[in-house]
């Protein structure tokens, strides 16, 4: 069994300084560990590259909304 206590923690220390086209994005996940210094989002691109982004930025929030929308048809 994996040792959860010693599991590695992924943190973001710097954010991308340019907006990424949603067409290049495949998924995202939040950094939820309290061990990390910054609140962050990690986008995974269609070529499997991972990019740290600032969740306070509107384009990041809009991109997450766009990706969510692909998983289910919304009732607006």
């Amino acid at each position: 069994q994996p040792d959860a206590i010693n599991a590695p923690v992924t943190c973001c220390y710097n954010f991308t300084n340019r907006k990424i086209s949603v067409q290049r994005l495949a998924s995202y996940r939040r950094i939820t560990s309290s061990k990390c210094p910054k609140e962050a989002v990690i986008f995974k691109t269609i070529v499997a590259k991972e990019i740290c982004a600032d969740p306070k930025q509107k384009w990041v929030q809009d991109s997450m909304d766009h990706l969510d929308k692909q998983t289910q048809t919304p009732k607006t």
Epitope: V41, P55, D65, D68
Partner: nanobody, 123 residues
């Protein structure tokens, strides 16, 4: 960490309305998709509704479409669930949740949960 506190539950009659609130603190509220789930005794936790970060898109379980409305106020760090035409089968503990991964109706994509508020609908 995100802290979520639900309120507004109670005992009502079938056909009545209730409005649940969920107050968030601790992180940037507008950066989280917010969801509502419910769990009745002896049943699994089920998706009820969710709302996008902007508030422009809402998502509903088939069982509540046309009766429940999910909304949010990013200035107040609060999400709401307006429940109309309540039915006895809506009786459950209702939980507010904040997203951690891509998705909408899968509870596994929500990383933060409130303690829940009881809603009881009598016939």
């Amino acid at each position: 960490e995100v802290q979520l506190v639900e309120s507004g539950g109670g005992l009502v009659q079938a056909g009545d309305s209730l409005r649940l609130s969920c107050a968030a603190s601790g992180r940037t509220f507008s950066s989280y998709r917010m969801g509502w789930f419910r769990q009745a005794p002896g049943k699994e936790r089920e998706f009820v509704a969710a709302i996008s970060r902007s508030g422009a898109s809402a998502y509903y379980a088939d069982s509540v479409k046309g009766r429940f409305t999910c909304s949010r106020d990013n200035a107040k760090d609060t999400v709401y669930l307006q429940m109309n035409k309540l039915k006895p089968e809506d009786t459950a503990v209702y939980y507010c949740a904040a997203s951690s991964r891509m998705g909408v109706d899968d509870p596994e994509t929500y990383g933060y949960w409130g303690q829940g508020t009881q809603v009881t609908v009598s016939s």
